[in-house]
Interface confidence: medium
């Protein structure tokens, strides 16, 4: 099943999305994606990044980290109810067979009477732990493994369990981090 | 190294039905999406099915649909395109090829519809 | 009717750079990723450049795509005989979900 993400109404929410460029500068294309992640490309696609820039974005949609040193994390401003769904995260690997996908589930809640400050985010869930193994996993899944084809050392899902997101430091231990190189 | 080989085309009847088969090795077939292209002769490529990896999704053009079925036995490593009610325009040479970038192909397996 | 455009044939002298274009709409080369193949007599198609126009292994640079917009095209420098082959372009569809190619351009090496 999809990972799990929280926002309130009103709130910007965050779905994080990871990997290491192989070197500064070379950048894998990540398209972002309203809907579960498709066989091919990102269904209604939201935020697209190249090998220099974001060259595709709509409104509320945007990468606050450094997607230059591989954060393509979604960040969605002023969220409604209407954005509650699965979200795709795609890392367009080139030179192999499959790319990386993510389906990310986000759950809008009601605003509360004293709402909470704006950057902080409720993860309930966390990718699970997997180690590198012979070939990579099914393109409908979050399990991932080793692609020889582009020389990955290391595809590798981080934290069992967010336990405290209001440091920004862990936003990043929440999601799928791939590194290539 | 990554092969594709395609069978089952033959000479068929209009109205009759054939199943194509494609034999992976080389790679982890379940980890992939496959997808079928065919090419008439001395025309173009074109575009038959997808299947994602554990079958979950599944595409196929206009032309075809409701007359093909594509599947997939991922513990023998083999794609399929079940054919029915063919007619005289699907006659080509058809063609399985891997992944999300289509980088794989096979050597293809001719389907002649013919009274 | 191919979804894509291409140019039905296109010639040059060895040594020449060639362009081959392919032209579609905003739901699949605007939107997507163009994928060029070369189809030599007689073979079956094989990728030439894929995502951000990069080149599978074994893919001479001599080859290199690019895309602006809704036109996507391919340059061949340094032609030589042995590139003398149809090619195609393709690219996922969002609107149809579906592949779709263009009708093929035949190279003539003079």
């Known amino acids: 099943s999809e990972v799990e993400y929280r926002a309130e109404v009103g709130q910007n929410a965050y779905l994080p999305c990871f990997y290491t460029p192989a070197a500064p500068g070379n950048l894998v294309p990540v398209c972002w994606g309203k809907g579960a992640c498709p066989v091919f490309e990102c269904g209604n696609v939201v935020l697209r990044t190249d090998e220099r820039d974001v060259n595709y974005w709509t409104s509320r949609y945007w990468l606050n980290g450094d997607f230059r040193k591989g954060d393509v994390s979604l960040t969605i401003e002023n969220v409604t109810l209407a954005d509650s769904g699965i979200y795709c995260c795609r890392i367009q690997i080139p030179g192999i067979m499959n790319d990386e996908k993510f389906n990310l589930k986000l759950v809008i809640k009601p605003a509360k009477v004293t709402p909470a400050p704006t950057r902080q985010r409720d993860f309930t869930a966390a990718f699970p732990r997997m180690l590198t193994t012979r070939g990579h996993g099914p393109a409908e899944t979050q399990t991932l493994g080793s692609l020889p084809d582009i020389n990955l050392t290391q595809i590798s899902t981080l934290a069992n369990e967010l336990r405290d997101s209001r440091l920004a430091n862990d936003l990043r231990d929440s999601g799928a981090t791939i590194r290539i190189g | 190294q990554v092969q594709l080989v395609e069978s089952g085309g033959g000479l068929v009847k209009p109205g009759g039905s054939l199943r194509l088969s494609c034999a992976a090795s080389g790679f982890t077939f379940s980890s992939y999406s496959m997808n079928w292209v065919r090419q008439a002769p001395g025309k173009g490529l074109e575009w038959v099915s997808s299947?994602?990896?554990?079958?979950?999704?599944?595409y196929y053009a206009d032309s075809v649909k409701g007359r093909f079925t594509i599947s997939r036995d991922n513990a023998k490593n083999s794609l399929y395109l079940q054919m029915n009610s063919l007619r005289a325009e699907d006659t080509a040479v058809y063609y399985c090829a891997s992944g999300d970038h289509m980088d794989v192909w096979g050597q293809g397996t001719t389907v002649t519809v013919s009274s | 009717q191919p979804v894509l455009t291409q140019p039905p044939s296109a010639s040059g002298t060895p040594g020449q750079r060639v362009t081959i274009s392919c032209s579609g709409s905003?739901?699949?080369?605007?939107?997507?990723?163009v994928y060029w193949y070369q189809q030599l007599p007689g073979t079956a198609p094989k990728l030439l450049t894929h995502i951000n126009n990069q080149r599978p292994s074994g893919v001479p640079d001599r080859f290199s795509g690019s895309k602006s917009g809704t036109s996507a095209s391919l340059a061949i420098s340094g032609l030589r005989s042995e590139q003398e082959a149809d090619y195609y372009c393709?690219?996922?569809?969002?609107?149809?979900?579906?592949?779709?190619f263009g009708g093929g351009t035949k190279l003539t090496v003079l």
């Open positions: 299947i994602s990896s554990s079958s979950s999704y599944i």
């Open positions: 393709a690219a996922w569809d969002a609107t149809l979900s579906a592949w779709v």
């Open positions: 905003s739901s699949n080369v605007g939107t997507n990723y």
